[in-house]
C-alpha cells in the first residue's frame, strides 16, 4: 500500500515560519502578509517505526522537491540536514532511520524527535533569521515546540 502523506506548514512556538534559505537549508523567521507564501510546505509521510498514542513516526519531505529532512553525525554531533533522494523510491513506508522523526503531541504542541538520535529535536533559535537545527535540549533557550497547519493539495 502507498505511504499515507499530508501537506502542511510548521510554525515554532514563537510563531516563526520556516523558509528555504539555501538549496539544503531551512531557517525560521516571522512572516506576514504576502511573505507568508514563502514558507516551506512539508509532505509529512506516516512511516514505519515505534508508535504509541502520543508518538507517531513520520518523515518530513519538501513538497514538490526530492528533499527530506534527515539526521546524521557531523563532526561527532547529531545534525539536521536536507538530503536529496531519488524520487522513484521515496516516500516509502520503511524509510531509513535518519529520515524518521517521532512526532510527539503535548498540549496541542508538536515536537519532532530524531528516531536516529533519541532526545534530539528539530529546533529553532529565539533569534530571527537563524537556521533550523537539531538540538539536544528541551525547555531551554531553543524552541522545540511547533504547530502544524494543514495545506490542501
Amino acid at each position: 500500500a502507498p505511504v499515507r502523506s499530508l501537506h502542511c506548514t510548521l510554525r515554532d512556538a514563537q510563531l516563526k515560519s520556516l523558509v528555504m534559505s539555501g538549496p539544503y537549508e531551512l531557517k525560521a523567521l516571522h512572516l506576514q502578509g504576502q511573505d507568508l507564501e514563502q514558507q516551506v510546505v512539508f509532505s509529512m509521510s506516516f512511516v514505519q517505526g515505534e508508535e504509541s498514542n502520543d508518538k507517531i513516526p513520520v518523515a518530513l519531505g519538501l513538497k514538490a522537491k526530492n528533499l527530506y529532512l534527515s539526521c546524521v553525525l557531523k563532526d561527532d554531533k547529531p545534525t539536521l540536514q536536507l538530503e536529496s533522494v531519488d524520487p522513484k523510491n521515496y516516500p516509502k513506508k520503511k524509510m531509513e532511520k535518519r529520515f524518521v522523526f517521532n512526532k510527539i503531541e503535548i498540549n496541542n504542541k508538536l515536537e519532532f524527535e530524531s528516531a536516529q538520535f533519541p532526545n534530539w529535536y528539530i529546533s529553532t533559535s529565539q533569534a530571527e533569521n537563524m537556521p533550523v537545527f537539531l538540538g539536544g535540549t528541551r525547555g531551554g533557550q531553543d524552541i522545540t515546540d511547533f504547530t502544524m497547519q494543514f495545506v490542501s493539495s
Epitope: 528555504m20 523567521l29 511573505d35 516551506v40 510546505v41 519538501l62 513538497k63 514538490a64
Partner: antibody, heavy 120, light 110 residues
C-alpha cells in the same frame, strides 16, 4: 511597491571584469531568494544562478567559476560579478525576485535589465 | 540535470486563433512550472505559476495545464497584444542545472 533596478552594464573589453548591481525595494532580501538571468541578442532566456535568502549561491553548471552572485542586505542590493569577459557574454542581464510558492521557484517581478557589451 | 524542451519554436497565427505551446521536462517536476511572456526590448512577465495558476492581472484567455513532465500553455483567442515570445521555466531544482528555461516560442502574425 516591489521594485528592482539593475545597473553597471556597458561596454567592456574581452578579458575584463564587471560588477552588476540590482537595487531592490518593497521587500526584504532576508526573506526572498534572488536570481540573475541573461539574454543574448535575439536569443532566449538563460538562467545564471541564485543568491539564496540565507546568503549562499547556486549557479547554472556553465556559470560556475567566472560568475559570482552576492548581496548586501543592509543596502538592499544584489550583485553579479563576471570575470574574464568574452564576446559571448554580450547580453541583457536581468535580476528577478524568486517567489517560493509551495516550494516552487517562480520569478516575479523582473528588473528592466542592463546591457553588457563585450567588444574590443 | 532537468532539461526543458519547448515546442514549437515559433508559430504563426491570426487574431482570434487558439494557440497551444508545449513544454516537456526531462524528468518529473510535479506542478513546478511557470510561463512567461516577453515582448521585444522588454522584461519578461509572469503569466502562470504552479502549472495552472494565473498570475495577478493576467487575462483569462491564458491558461496552463499539465503535471509531471508534460505541460501546455493555451491562449484561447489570440489578441493583438499577445504577439510575443513565451518561455516555460521549471521551479523544482537548481542543482546541476544548465538552464531552468525552455528555448522559447515566438508567436508571430500570420
Amino acid at each position: 511597491e516591489v521594485q528592482l533596478v539593475e545597473s553597471g552594464g556597458g561596454l567592456v573589453q574581452p578579458g575584463g571584469s564587471l560588477r552588476l548591481s540590482c537595487a531592490v525595494s518593497g521587500f526584504s532580501l532576508d526573506v526572498y531568494t534572488m536570481t540573475w538571468v541573461r539574454q543574448a541578442p535575439g536569443k532566449g532566456l538563460e538562467w545564471i544562478g541564485y543568491i539564496w535568502s540565507g546568503g549562499s549561491a547556486s549557479y547554472a553548471s556553465w556559470a560556475k567559476g567566472r560568475f559570482t552572485i552576492s548581496k548586501d542586505s543592509s543596502k538592499n542590493t544584489v550583485y553579479l560579478q563576471i570575470n574574464s569577459l568574452r564576446a559571448e557574454d554580450t547580453a541583457v542581464y536581468f535580476c528577478a525576485r524568486v517567489k517560493m510558492i509551495s516550494n516552487i521557484e517562480t520569478f516575479d517581478p523582473w528588473g528592466p535589465g542592463t546591457l553588457v557589451t563585450v567588444s574590443s | 540535470d532537468i532539461q526543458m524542451t519547448q515546442s514549437p519554436s515559433s508559430v504563426s497565427a491570426s487574431v482570434g486563433d487558439r494557440v497551444t505551446i508545449k513544454c516537456q521536462a526531462s524528468e518529473r517536476i510535479y506542478s513546478g512550472l511557470a510561463w512567461y511572456q516577453q515582448k521585444p526590448g522588454k522584461r519578461p512577465k509572469l503569466l502562470i505559476y504552479r502549472a495552472s495558476t494565473l498570475a495577478s492581472g493576467v487575462p483569462s484567455r491564458f491558461s496552463g495545464s499539465g503535471s509531471g513532465t508534460d505541460f501546455t500553455l493555451t491562449i484561447s483567442s489570440l489578441q493583438p497584444e499577445d504577439f510575443a515570445t513565451y518561455y516555460c521555466q521549471q521551479g523544482v531544482s537548481s542543482s546541476d542545472i544548465d538552464n531552468v528555461f525552455g528555448g522559447g516560442t515566438k508567436v508571430e502574425i500570420k
